[in-house]
């Protein structure tokens, strides 16, 4: 519905596989199991920012 | 233009202490994860711990828990390492690495992009 | 913690050759896993991040692959610029963890 999801910043087991819910600007690390500052996909023959939207998964880029 | 500088490398003997820095330019450290790696003379590269500056969650390698201390400075924009009870096997290069995550639903798909130029420790006597 | 078991550990390639390299990850890192390019004296460089992502401004004969714990790193004519010591890393899991190292060198 729009509306802002909070972002949680508790504590989580190390074995926790469950996402944190984070901020519209933000991503869930596996690797530090917390929010962080997340950006959207660079495509690399450009170097521009793509037009890829939240909730978009990513494609792998060919290679020659 | 990101960029990531490291410091305070040196020769120090056995037991000793030494405090490496990491200037990040370019971009706030508290957006991001902050890494030390580090790579023995002709070997391959350790992950020695990271940060998260925005809530000071931190990580180690086994090999330097206990010993090494990983923190960070939001307002000077700057990652520390303090190392304490050296051993002449953590003599190295040191360097700093940013993580960055692109979002892929709602998870990081991310690597180290930005690397700082290393500093070198030497622990010997 | 997982370990990362990169093969080979050097390998001797001329310029145009197609040269591949494995990655095997001791339990299951979905696509966690990033490859990097170092040269002697200098710091490593992001080529691949997510198995097969293309890092921006890496050429495009550079390509990754995989999934779970097997992951290929391939450069599909390799030029002069390209003989470095190649390494890969999981990101799935603290702590991240880097494979041996692969050193590619001129036949």
């Known amino acids: 519905m729009g509306a802002r999801r909070l972002r949680v910043r508790s504590q989580r087991s190390r074995d926790s596989s469950v996402p944190t819910q984070c901020n519209q600007t933000e991503c869930f690390d596996p690797l530090v199991r917390n929010c962080v500052s997340c950006e959207l996909f660079h495509t690399p023959d450009t170097g521009h920012t793509s037009s890829l939207e939240p909730g978009t998964a990513l494609q792998p880029q060919e290679g020659s | 233009e990101v960029q990531l500088v490291e410091s305070g490398g040196g020769l120090v003997q056995p037991g000793g202490s030494l405090r490496l820095s990491c200037a990040a330019s370019?971009?706030?450290?508290?957006?991001?994860?902050i890494h030390w790696v580090r790579q023995a003379p002709g070997k391959g590269l350790e992950w020695v711990a990271w940060?998260?500056?925005?809530?000071?969650?931190?990580d180690y390698a086994d090999s330097v828990k206990g010993r090494f201390t990983i923190s960070a400075d939001t307002s000077k924009n700057t990652a520390y390492l303090q190392m304490n009870s050296l051993r002449a096997e953590d003599t190295a290069v040191y360097y700093c690495?940013?993580?960055?995550?692109?979002?892929?639903?709602?998870?990081?798909?991310?690597?180290?992009?930005?690397w700082g130029q290393g500093t070198l420790v030497t622990v010997s006597s | 913690d997982i370990q990362m078991t990169q093969s080979p550990s050097s390998l001797s390639a001329s310029v145009g050759d197609r040269v591949t390299i494995t990655c095997r990850a001791s339990?299951?890192?979905?696509?966690?896993v990033a490859w990097y390019q170092q040269k002697p004296g200098k710091a490593p460089k992001l080529l691949i991040y997510s198995a097969s992502f293309l890092y921006s401004g890496v050429p495009s004969r550079f390509s990754g692959s995989g999934s779970g714990t097997d992951f290929t790193l391939t450069i599909s004519s390799l030029q002069p610029e390209d003989f470095a010591t190649y390494y890969c890393?999981?990101?799935?899991?603290?702590?991240?963890?880097f494979g041996q190292g692969t050193k590619v060198e001129i036949k």
């Open positions: 370019g971009f706030t450290i508290s957006s991001n994860s």
């Open positions: 690495a940013r993580r960055v995550c692109y979002n892929n639903l709602g998870v990081c798909a991310g690597a180290m992009d930005y």
């Open positions: 890393q999981q990101t799935s899991t603290s702590p991240p963890t």
């Open positions: 940060i998260t500056p925005s809530d000071g969650n931190t």
């Open positions: 339990q299951d890192v979905s696509t966690a």
